[in-house]
């Protein structure tokens, strides 16, 4: 807490300008009017204040706006945003995408901080849903943003917003998140033709069910191994050798290198060895010829 001292003669700030960088902390407290600071916040960013000086400026704004800053001030916080705590930010009502962009710009090049996470949460809750423009903005600053949301939060993403998602935005998503995003993507891209559809849906296929994979296998899509390896194991297991061959096209040869890894390993275990042999890849571990396969899960369901 800075002591209340009188402003020295001739030092009363008439405007927010560069001369303030030479003020000591107590001089800033005594000589800068909070209302003046609020109306000229846009000037603060271009002035090289120290963190200690920024602390004083924040303190002045906190006194002026104990219930939370108005958006006109928030939009111009700039570097001062890094001084805010999540508790401060929870008092704000941020509705403008321009304000959100301005504050994300300040944190650019750094990991998502608790302040940024709180700001985004406040903004999205205020909007009611994660619309396309917001998603565009957030993934531009934080490619991993989507994958940081819970499946529940992802359920508020409208299918129209899926057009803003780039493949790299989904890199860190787990199957539970892709389970939520895949049906939205399928809906969003439903009017595209075969090859274009596959290009767009490919990144989301980690959430695709068996029947959709079977349908894709009829479309000569030539799925690459990296995509295949991200498919849900339970969705891959029911696929026949012929279906996998059609799904992968020329990439089928890559199965050999992945035969010890899921989902390829588990899929091999479910196939007849003589079916696997037709691929000519030397895949081993299939069901030997003459063995009867009982689907125990089916049996349990019937009993």
């Amino acid at each position: 807490e800075v002591e209340k001292t009188a402003c020295p003669s001739g030092k009363k700030a008439r405007e927010i300008d560069e001369s303030l960088i030479f003020y000591k902390k107590w001089e800033l407290e005594a000589c800068v009017d909070a209302a003046l600071l609020a109306t000229q916040m846009d000037r603060v960013n271009a002035i090289p204040f120290t963190y200690e000086q920024l602390d004083v400026l924040k303190h002045k704004l906190d006194e002026l706006y104990p219930q939370g800053y108005p958006e006109s001030v928030i939009q111009h916080l700039g570097y001062l945003f890094l001084k805010m705590s999540p508790e401060d930010i929870r008092k704000w009502n941020v509705t403008s995408l321009e304000t959100l962009k301005a504050l994300l710009e300040v944190n650019k090049g750094h990991e998502m901080s608790p302040q940024v996470a709180t700001l985004i949460d406040r903004f999205v809750k205020g909007r009611g849903q994660l619309d396309k423009d917001t998603l565009d903005t957030l993934t531009a600053f934080y490619p991993g943003y989507l994958c940081s949301l819970s499946p529940e939060e992802l359920s508020s993403v409208p299918p129209s917003s899926i057009w803003a998602v780039r493949p790299q935005d989904l890199d860190t998503c787990d199957p539970r998140q892709l389970d939520v995003l895949y049906p939205k993507a399928r809906l969003a891209f439903q009017n595209m033709n075969g090859s274009e559809y596959f290009v767009k849906i490919q990144s989301f296929l980690g959430g695709a069910p068996t029947e959709d994979l079977k349908a894709l296998s009829q479309q000569n899509v030539s799925m690459d191994l990296a995509t295949f390896m991200k498919l849900r194991t339970d969705a891959v297991l029911p696929l026949t050798v012929a279906e996998v061959q059609k799904l992968l096209g020329p990439h089928v040869e890559g199965l050999k290198a992945e035969e010890r890894h899921r989902p390829v390993r588990d899929w091999i275990l479910r196939q007849r060895q003589d079916d696997l042999d037709t691929l000519g890849l030397g895949l081993q571990g299939g069901i030997p010829n003459g063995y009867l396969v009982l689907d125990l899960s089916m049996q349990e369901a019937l009993s």
Epitope: E15, D17, E18, S19, A46, I47, P48, G78, V106, K108
Partner: antibody, heavy 115, light 111 residues
Framework: QVQLVQSGAEVKKPGSSVKVSCKAS????????FSWVRQAPGQGLEWMGG????????NYAQKFQGRVTITADESTSTAYMELSSLRSEDTAVYYC????????WGQGTLVTVSS | DIALTQPASVSGSPGQSITISCTGT?????????VSWYQQHPGKAPKLMIY???KRPSGVSNRFSGSKSGNTASLTISGLQAEDEADYYC???????????FGGGTKLTVL
Amino acid sequence: QVQLVQSGAEVKKPGSSVKVSCKASGGTFSSYYFSWVRQAPGQGLEWMGGIIPKFGSANYAQKFQGRVTITADESTSTAYMELSSLRSEDTAVYYCARRTSMDYWGQGTLVTVSS
Amino acid sequence: DIALTQPASVSGSPGQSITISCTGTSSDVGGYNYVSWYQQHPGKAPKLMIYSVSKRPSGVSNRFSGSKSGNTASLTISGLQAEDEADYYCATWDHSQMGKVFGGGTKLTVL
């Protein structure tokens, strides 16, 4: 339109002093920070010091401390830089620049130190 | 004393994009958003191209952009043109001496 106009080229003897002026027009003078930067032939930019005219007191780079004096005259909107005890390695173009971001620069003043 | 490190030279062909880096420490480039970039043609005064890491003064082409990641700031010039051939300097504000510190400069050659 902001303009910074500097005084003309100077030729000085080693051990002497030089005073370069920088007259500002087209904007507020008193509350801006004015810097002096020099550039020796074929070399990079080197900050020497600066002043906020309304306060009058200047601050200097350690390298030039004691040898450079920066002043400002609010009545004529002019900043000055005086460098004393000149030596041959002080031969350079000297620039004044406005604000900490240095958004406007003077045209430069060539100071040649030679015996 | 703060020291900002820049590559001595960079080159590119017309139409290409080039990036010039400026590396400092967590207490200057990394800690604050006060990085500026200046362009200097031979025999001319420097010109401010970028301030506060990524802001462009009015009149500067949007082919010039600034960014920062960790302790390194970068100037990117897209759609390279012959008139971009010049020396480029990064600078930051040094709170300890209350003054400006410049990088060593980078000579950009347009092939």
